[in-house]
Amino acid sequence: SGVFQLQLQEFINERGVLASGRPCEPGCRTFFRVCLKHFQAVVSPGPCTFGTVSTPVLGTNSFAVRDDSSGGGRNPLQLPFNFTWPGTFSLIIEAWHAPGDDLRPEALPPDALISKIAIQGSLAVGQNWLLDEQTSTLTRLRYSYRVICSDNYYGDNCSRLCKKRNDHFGHYVCQPDGNLSCLPGWTGEYCQQPICLSGCHEQNGYCSKPAECLCRPGWQGRLCNECIPHNGCRHGTCSTPWQCTCDEGWGGLFCDQDLNYCTHHSPCKNGATCSNSGQRSYTCTCRPGYTGVDCELELSECDSNPCRNGGSCKDQEDGYHCLCPPGYYGLHCEHSTLSCADSPCFNGGSCRERNQGANYACECPPNFTGSNCEKKVDRCTSNPCANGGQCLNRGPSRMCRCRPGFTGTYCELHVSDCARNPCAHGGTCHDLENGLMCTCPAGFSGRRCEVRTSIDACASSPCFNRATCYTDLSTDTFVCNCPYGFVGSRCEFPVGLPPSFPW
């Protein structure tokens, strides 16, 4: 698949005549028809097997044709083909005269031909333009042409299809000859095979994208070159997956039986001697002055637990010292500090013991705070009242005293004088800065539209059958809105019973 491109450059018809010799009046409005076909030793009109294209009127008599390719125009002319370019061609270029705007053959004069040229030959696919000039008795045409491959087609005949892609089916761009060029990190005939992380084990590792190393079952590590030992293997290694070869000093199926606890754990403290006495068992032989299973205890005055109330004993060179927990004091932590029994909470606060009575916490009533409820809360400190409202402390709460024209908990709402709908008889209410004003409908007046100025046409109850009466204020007439089942200007007729008119 490719495109034969024809670039018309200049047409000369100095005398402004047709092929017949007849002058065009006032000039030859020239357009071109191009026919591209298979190679013929003698080029003749007929089926344009490779394609045909026409131009609009490009000029009159003699003119240069500008390159329109940048603006998506018609020059160069494009003759696409969807087959392998054969390397040879025939080309017919006709110049025609169109007196009007209709360029269809049947709309042209019977002698509309200005000139025709026919060429044939070999043409290889390539970017370079071939320049040609054809001269007849009265005209001259300069043009150039070339064949290029369509997008995604490559090779000497535009027959090799290659569309760059980067998806599951391949990761490549196309070389000028149409061969694939793999994107970095991909290999294989169609660049579908990722190149794994450098050093990734060939057998034990694989990858689904470049620079990756995913391990096959039984293998681990950055390069999948480390075997995974048997599940639960504690102190063992493997040379192939799922093995568990025990380290020295360990035994059992999972190498979790400690045959050398002394070496592995050094459990004996303070310079004691450790002796293995079977699986996970040992004996510590303490140095003088120490005791305990691991010889961790120093024999001292604290052994008699002299500290009370949870105090901790610390050995000192000249005796011992008790560290008392909160709420206790004294040599042996025998004295207690304040508790709920001492009523430490002010202003009606409730006392709650904490840490088994060692200390306490006060729960304060509203308006009081502090660890002993000794501070009074001022609820007006945050200026909560809007629009100049005054904040007042009222026992456990606060309130806002609003300026005239405002309401709401925080004086945040503007009071509309119209909110009460003060205008009667459908009057329209207008808020003013210091009051309101009513605009009254026709038939009413007064500050609140309370005064009727026209006759109420409904006063005489002219509507029958419980119809609703409306006064038309503009005409002082009435309109009856009939209930279901009645008709007539006064709703006087039941539906279905035609009125008996006197005429």
Epitope: L18, A19, S20, G21, R22, S44, P45, G46, W96, R104, P105, E106, A107, L108, P109, P110, D111, A112, L113, S115, K116, S136, T137
Partner: antibody, heavy 119, light 106 residues
């Protein structure tokens, strides 16, 4: 069916006049150039006159210039040839022909009508 | 004036190829049409624009035009092809016909 039917031929004396008609059907008459071509007995074809689709352009052979007039009435789909100052050498079968646009030639011909100029 | 010259007659055997020429100065720069006319009948367009066939004309009719000569070729000639053949082109605002060639199929 595309068709051209000539009429109006006959015997006329030298110096006399005739009006030939050609009724067109089966195609868009007002879109095409039309022509008259004649053929003397035993001779070849000779082009006589041509008219553009809208009647604004007319061409004549030198041999009939000033004597013959080509015209058309697109509303009636009819082509005319007014023959004046007839001569013996104008004796021929007169064909009406539709001219194909763009050097196609004459793609539809009528059956012809005979004009005889004789005293 | 511009004249199109044709041979008066051409003979051919059935099934053979017949070639009828039409000559004029620089004729190859113009388009040529060919007509077939049988005795007592109106002409019929068989080739236009040098080599194109109207619909309904058999493929055995072909044409070419270059230099000073246009050629009508009938390959595999049949007896029904026996007729007068006339070429036509343009000179200035005149339609020009050749004198015609009588094709005889022997």
């Amino acid at each position: 069916e595309v068709q051209l039917v000539e009429s109006g031929g006959g015997l006329v004396q030298p110096g006399g006049s005739l009006r030939l008609s050609c009724a067109a059907s089966g195609f868009t008459f007002q879109s095409h150039w039309m022509s008259w071509v004649r053929q003397a007995p035993g001779k070849g074809l000779e082009w006589v006159a041509m008219i553009s689709y809208d009647g604004t352009i007319k061409y004549y052979a030198d041999s009939v210039k000033g004597r013959f007039t080509i015209s058309r009435d697109n509303s009636k789909n009819t082509l005319y040839l007014q023959l004046n100052s007839l001569r013996a050498e104008d004796t021929a079968v007169y064909y009406c022909a539709k001219a194909g646009g763009g050097n196609v030639g004459f793609d539809i011909w009528g059956q012809g009508t005979m004009v005889t100029v004789s005293s | 004036s511009y004249e199109l010259t044709q041979p008066p007659s051409v003979s051919v055997s059935p099934g053979q190829t017949a070639s009828i020429t039409c000559s004029a100065d620089k004729l190859g720069t113009k388009y040529v049409s060919w007509y077939q006319q049988k005795p007592g009948q109106s002409p019929v367009l068989v080739i236009y624009q040098d080599a194109k066939r109207p619909s309904g004309i058999p493929e055995r009719f072909s044409g070419s035009n270059s230099g000073n000569t246009a050629t009508l070729t009938i390959s595999g000639t049949q007896t029904m092809d026996e007729a007068d053949y006339l070429c036509q082109s343009w000179d200035r605002s005149d339609v020009v016909f050749g004198g015609g060639t009588k094709l005889t199929v022997l």
